[in-house]
């Protein structure tokens, strides 16, 4: 807390400019009008203020807006955003994607901080759903964003947003998340032709039921082993040897290297040895 002291004669700030970097903390507090600061927030980032000086500027904004900053100020916070606490951010009403992008840019290259997580949560809740433009933006800054959401949160993602998802965005998703995303992907991509459809749906197949895997096995898709290993064990177990052979195509030879790992291990144990022998891979049930 900075003590309230009178502004020395001639030091009253008429605008936010470089001269302020030479002000002591108490002088900033006494000589910078909060309303002036709010209207000229876009200048703050061009001035090399110290962290201590930024603390004072934040304090002034907090006093001016005790109920939370307006979006006109939030959009121009820049590095001052790093000074905000999740509690501060919970008071905000962020509706513009441009504002969101501006603040994510400040944190770019870093792990998702509690502040950023709170900001995103406020933004998505304000919009009511995770639309395509928002998802595009969030996954561009944080490729793992989608997989940080619970299945419950993913339930509000409209199928149209799935077009924004890249394979790497799903790398850390677990089966429960893919459970929810896979049907949305099926809806989104179903009008594509066979080979294009498989390219798009492949990353989501960890949520596919047995019947869909059987259907894919009839379409010469040549699923790679990495995708096969991410399939739900309960979905793989009912597949016959012939179906797995068709599903994997030339990649079927990779089963040997994965025979001790799920779901391959469990699937092998469910098959008749005679059927496994037809693969010529030396798999033992």
């Amino acid at each position: 807390e900075v003590e309230k002291t009178a502004c020395p004669s001639g030091k009253k700030a008429r605008e936010i400019d470089e001269s302020l970097i030479f002000y002591k903390k108490w002088e900033l507090e006494a000589c910078v009008d909060a309303a002036l600061l709010a209207t000229q927030m876009d200048r703050v980032n061009a001035i090399p203020f110290t962290y201590e000086q930024l603390d004072v500027l934040k304090h002034k904004l907090d006093e001016l807006y005790p109920q939370g900053y307006p979006e006109s100020v939030i959009q121009h916070l820049g590095y001052l955003f790093l000074k905000m606490s999740p509690e501060d951010i919970r008071k905000w009403n962020v509706t513009s994607l441009e504002t969101l992008k501006a603040l994510l840019e400040v944190n770019k290259g870093h792990e998702m901080s509690p502040q950023v997580a709170t900001l995103i949560d406020r933004f998505v809740k304000g919009r009511g759903q995770l639309d395509k433009d928002t998802l595009d933006t969030l996954t561009a800054f944080y490729p793992g964003y989608l997989c940080s959401l619970s299945p419950e949160e993913l339930s509000s993602v409209p199928p149209s947003s799935i077009w924004a998802v890249r394979p790497q965005d799903l790398d850390t998703c677990d089966p429960r998340q893919l459970d929810v995303l896979y049907p949305k992907a099926r809806l989104a991509f179903q009008n594509m032709n066979g080979s294009e459809y498989f390219v798009k749906i492949q990353s989501f197949l960890g949520g596919a039921p047995t019947e869909d895997l059987k259907a894919l096995s009839q379409q010469n898709v040549s699923m790679d082993l990495a995708t096969f290993m991410k399939l739900r064990t309960d979905a793989v177990l009912p597949l016959t040897v012939a179906e797995v052979q068709k599903l994997l195509g030339p990649h079927v030879e990779g089963l040997k290297a994965e025979e001790r790992h799920r779901p391959v291990r469990d699937w092998i144990l469910r098959q008749r040895q005679d059927d496994l022998d037809t693969l010529g891979l030396g798999l033992q049930g």
Epitope: P175, V180, P183, R186, Q190, P209, A215, D234
Partner: nanobody, 121 residues
């Protein structure tokens, strides 16, 4: 082409349990990816209540989780919603929804026409 029809009492007293059933005709719900419920309070947007997935996993809106149960009976081609300890804030049009097409080349999302449930004494 599936048809979904919600049924249940249109008026429920506060603190009681709201029970709705969704009856599906025109096809088997065994071929669905999920069976879910969504509601729309008067003058507000849609709110997802919860869904049961083909995998057997059930997911509920965290704000309603302690009060909601969704179950499915594929033999009767029905699924149901129970919402306990209701208040006036639970007054809404309730919709059942499902996405059919497991194992098929096409898939489609279907919705019931909705049923208004009013919570009042």
């Amino acid at each position: 082409q599936l048809q979904l029809q919600e049924s249940g009492p249109g008026l429920v007293k506060p603190s009681e349990t709201l029970s709705l059933t969704c009856t599906v005709s025109g096809g088997s719900i065994s071929n669905s990816y999920y069976w879910g419920w969504i509601r729309q309070p008067p003058g507000k947007g849609l709110e997802w209540i919860g869904s049961i997935y083909h995998s057997g996993n059930t997911y509920y809106n965290p704000s309603l989780k302690s009060r909601v149960t969704i179950s499915v009976d594929t033999s009767k081609n029905q699924f149901s919603l129970k919402l306990s300890s209701v208040t006036a804030a639970d007054t809404a049009v309730y919709y059942c929804t499902t996405q059919n097409g497991v194992g098929a080349t096409t898939t489609e999302e279907y919705w019931g026409q909705g049923t208004l449930v009013t919570v009042s004494s």
